[in-house]
């Protein structure tokens, strides 16, 4: 297949060169109903002829499908076909192509080392109070304190896994019991969700891009949260959760397994463990109210000790306080006993930057989290850049139809539950559903996978993280296998009925629809997205947490008119879409209310006014700071050097003309000679891969 | 080696008091406790209390209790007993003894003081 | 206070005789034992503790065993200078505790 266009061809010809048909542009299914076409047989679209790549022709009256923002961008190839190189060129084609495939594993490397480092920084930062919030007594009785709790430990640890694990080790020693723990694994499922969420923020540059890859990562927070709405209610009603659990940890005599794999950590440890290493445990310490944890740094210092364990006489206040009669003596004044002691020696310090500082766990954590971050950005940059000028022409195209085809009917429904397994295995090889997400949030945004693929992925990716989860459980000790094993189960029992709840039937696919529609608004209103970010990880979890603790009436007495506001909104809503004859004139819109409540306009207002401030300061600054900037204010012409905000603008107003947005634009180059940024010279020295 | 002498032999009126004296030798005084234990003519043995030469920490068996005071003197290694309000069925060789370290049983005896209480 | 009671009180033996004195407490005092020898007009002298640990310098012919409430003393082949009396002590709660003693005889 020609990337370019023949200019021969006087002929039109509607398999190579027509805007929607199935081998250039593949549509976005319909959001209502599950596609049962195959790539042939896609909805008809306005066919319009694509003229030569140097004709502006087509800039003018686009057809509606291509207004869909939701449709995939072409990236098509800008470079010299392969057939057209010279030896020469040939090699240096495939040399570059090489070095661009070890450039992206390099920074895909980065990538998943600044998300683990980004977890240990959390941890630093937040890991001692997260600690502190489960050694709160009212989880036992409250399973909404439970549930935020859960949310709160893992945003502020940056990891399920250790939020679960604290879970474990308080049922193991019955501090919490299992059905107060059900609760707190649903928050855990929901706090991970935020880590791509947060990766998807780096995309902010990019308003289409931007606009898909927030959709992508909030897909996994909408699901989580949804399928939270309506399960944990379930829960507290039915034990369900528990009762099957508990019904297969009775059946099985399970012996003690193996270790869960190690597969990603074994490549990304030998870096991370340079930067920082950290006492996990100290954390489950907390959360059993140890109180000289409390004093401990999390900041390992020693990687190598030796623990030796011996006999001591301790003098006891009586001899009830003898650990046994056998093990009991007086030397005729003080009572005496036997105790076993471990005595730690420390023999060789950990190999980490921080290991002499001596800093507090807050000061390592912040350098770390703003180091991270920058990182985590700047290899997210490199990581698209790098994919863009990789996935053009015939291997997009190979790419976008392996990823986002369906089967051949009748068997097409069966390709969302592959891709359920497909994101369940990954997530097991990589050992983490954060870092599987994560990556897959930077390809939803320039467009190579779908968010109704990205949709499956992700479910799968939550049933990858419990199957770890059961690992890791039956390889536990014995006296911590079964509440381990149980709450494992749970973890994965939760997400099946999520899946089942949220996925086969098309129309119960809420979540694509509640991502779409903020991604739409995320795009608009840059700032929303820290804004829904704060609010649903951390505002919300926070108010229910204070609520709860000063009483269940409280809670309920904020909460009951709070529900029913929301459910009212919601209520009117469907009627004003559905059938709103049925409401009173006044009723049928939102008009009614001043337009601080129905819009985000007027709050924009005050954002951009409230940012203002940072706009002068933002000239000059580096690419990664411009999108930090971007995502702050809708700053227009703040950043000359990178001008990524003033690109964006300029395109932003060209959208009164019925102009092709640029991220609409079938080949790259075109949109930048239109507007005068390329010279037209440089358009033919790209090299892609094929 | 590890010694314990004692004062001689003395002749109470019942009523008054009699304190004994136990020097110490060839070890740490004030690592091991000191005890004092009594032997009745023809009787078993009897023991009256104990003292830490480090702490200054006593204990005292309930039958003596208020009527006997356990003191050291750490400069001269030397323990003392004062049995005070003495009765005739006081009468007794009154033995010092080194606790084993950390242990109630005693392996180091003094000769004993034979306190006599007559009218 | 916990009582010791030794038996029996008195025990004729001849010389190179398997002697045994045994003594019962009134409750559980694990391992916490001695056992004493005192001669006519001597101070006693320990032998045993913490049940069955041999005192330095004492013979191998001497061993202790028992724990919880009852326990032995064994002399395995009665010598002359061991014709004398022996105590058992408890040092398992305070007061320390001895049993009324048993004493060995010529036969």
């Known amino acids: 297949m020609a990337p370019w266009p023949e200019l021969g061809d006087a002929q039109p010809n509607p398999d190579k060169y027509l805007e929607g048909a199935a081998g250039q542009q593949p549509t976005a299914p319909d959001k209502s109903k599950e596609t049962n076409k195959t790539d042939n047989t896609e909805a008809p679209v306005t066919k319009i002829e694509l003229l030569p790549s140097y004709s502006t022709a087509t800039l003018i009256d686009e057809p509606t499908e291509v207004d869909d923002p939701w449709n995939l961008p072409t990236l098509q190839d800008s470079g010299i076909k392969w057939s057209e190189r010279d030896t020469k060129g040939k090699i240096l084609c495939f040399f570059q192509g090489i070095g661009r495939l070890i450039l992206l594993l390099g920074f895909l490397y980065f990538f998943v080392c600044s998300l683990d480092i980004l977890s240990s920084a959390f941890q630093l930062v937040g890991g001692k109070m997260a600690g502190q919030f489960f050694s709160n007594s009212s989880i036992m009785s409250n399973p909404l304190l439970g549930l935020v709790i859960g949310v709160l430990v893992t945003v502020l640890v940056q990891s399920s896994s250790t939020s679960t694990s604290i879970v474990v080790s308080m049922v193991s020693s019955s501090l919490l019991t299992v059905r107060a723990a059900i609760p707190i694994i649903m928050g855990a499922n929901i706090g991970t969700s935020i880590t791509n969420t947060i990766v998807a923020l780096m995309q902010v540059g990019d308003r289409s891009e931007f606009r898909r890859a927030f959709a992508g990562a909030t897909v996994h927070d909408f699901f989580n949260w949804l399928s939270v709405l309506v399960l944990l209610p379930v829960e507290v009603a039915t034990h369900y959760l528990e009762i099957i659990t508990q019904l297969i940890v009775e059946s099985f005599h399970f012996k003690n397994g193996e270790d869960a794999p190690d597969l990603l950590k074994v490549i990304t440890k030998p870096f991370t463990k340079l930067i920082v290493q950290l006492d996990k445990k100290v954390i489950s310490q907390i959360a059993m109210n140890d109180e000289k944890a409390k004093n401990k740094s999390l900041v390992k210092i020693w990687c190598k000790t030796f623990t030796n364990k011996t006999q001591i006489n301790v003098t006891v206040p009586s001899t009830a306080n003898c650990t046994s009669p056998s093990l009991c003596w007086t030397d005729g004044i003080q009572n005496w006993t036997m105790k076993n002691v471990t005595y730690k020696e420390n023999i060789a310090k950990c190999q980490h930057i921080f290991v002499n500082f001596h800093l507090p766990d807050l000061a390592v954590g912040t350098i770390l989290l703003i180091l991270s971050l920058l990182v985590l950005c700047g290899c997210l940059i490199m990581i698209v850049k790098i994919l863009g000028s990789v996935l053009k022409g015939q291997v997009a195209t190979v790419i976008k139809k392996t990823i986002n085809t369906d089967f051949p009917f009748p068997f097409a429904w069966l390709t969302g539950y592959l891709a359920i397994l497909v994101g369940a295995g990954m997530t097991f090889i990589v050992q983490s559903s954060s870092v599987f997400t994560s990556a897959l949030t930077p390809l939803i945004g320039i467009g190579v996978i779908t968010i109704e693929r990205a949709y499956p992925l992700t479910l799968g990716s939550n049933i990858g993280t419990t199957t770890t989860a059961i690992l890791a459980a039956l390889a536990s000790p014995g006296n911590a296998l079964r509440s381990s094993l149980q709450i494992a189960l749970c973890h994965f029992f939760f997400n099946i009925s999520g899946i089942l709840l949220w996925y086969p039937i098309p129309f119960t696919r809420l979540p694509i629809r509640m991502a779409k529609g903020l991604g739409n608004i995320s795009a608009k209103y840059r700032w929303f997205a820290v804004f829904y970010l704060i609010i649903f990880f951390f505002l919300i979890p926070l108010t229910v947490f204070g609520l709860s603790l000063a009483g269940w009436r409280v809670l309920v007495g904020v909460g009951v008119p709070v529900v029913f506001i929301i459910i009212l909104v919601l209520c009117l809503r469907l009627l004003q879409s559905r059938c709103p004859r049925v409401l009173p004139k006044k009723l049928q819109n939102w008009n009614f209310l001043p337009l601080w409540m129905r819009s985000l306009k007027p709050w924009d207002a005050v954002v951009s006014k409230f940012t203002g401030c940072f706009q002068m300061r933002c000239c000059c600054c580096c690419r990664v700071c411009c999108r930090a900037c971007c995502l702050l204010c809708d700053c227009p012409k703040c950043c000359r050097c990178s001008k990524c905000c003033e690109d964006l603008e300029e395109a932003q107003e060209g959208q009164d003309v019925p102009v092709k947005a640029p991220e609409t634009f079938d080949n790259i180059t075109i949109s930048r000679e239109a507007q005068g940024e390329v010279p037209a010279s440089d358009s033919k020295t790209e090299c892609t891969a094929l | 080696q590890v010694q314990l002498v004692e004062s001689g032999a003395e002749v109470k009126q019942p009523g008054e008091s009699v304190k004994v004296s136990c020097k110490t030798s060839?070890?740490?005084?004030?690592?091991?406790?000191v005890h004092w234990v009594r032997q009745a003519p023809g009787q078993g043995l009897e023991w009256m209390g104990a003292?830490?030469?480090?702490?200054?920490?006593?204990s005292y068996a309930q039958k003596f209790q208020g009527r006997v005071t356990l003191t050291v003197d750490k400069s001269t290694s030397t323990a003392y007993m004062e049995l005070s309000s003495l009765r005739s069925e006081d009468t007794a060789v009154y033995y010092c003894?080194?606790?084993?370290?950390?242990?109630?049983?005693?392996?180091?005896w003094g000769q004993g003081t034979l306190v006599t209480v007559s009218s | 206070d916990i009582q010791m009671t030794q038996s029996p009180s008195f025990l004729s033996a001849s010389v190179g005789d398997r002697v045994t004195i045994t003594c019962s407490a009134s409750?559980?005092?694990?391992?916490?034992v001695a056992w004493y020898q005192q001669k006519p007009g001597q101070s006693p002298k320990e032998l045993i503790y913490?049940?069955?640990n041999r005192f330095t310098g004492v013979p191998s012919r001497f061993s202790g065993s028992g724990s919880g409430t009852d326990f032995t003393l064994t002399i395995s082949s009665l010598q002359p200078e061991d014709f004398a009396t022996y105590y058992c002590?408890?040092?398992?709660?305070?007061?320390?505790?001895f049993g009324q003693g048993t004493k060995v005889e010529i036969k």
């Open positions: 003894a080194r606790g084993g370290f950390r242990l109630g049983s005693m392996d180091y």
């Open positions: 060839g070890y740490t005084f004030t690592t091991y406790n």
């Open positions: 003292i830490s030469p480090g702490s200054g920490l006593t």
């Open positions: 409750q559980n005092v694990g391992t916490s």
């Open positions: 913490w049940a069955s």
């Open positions: 002590q408890q040092y398992s709660s305070p007061p320390l505790t």
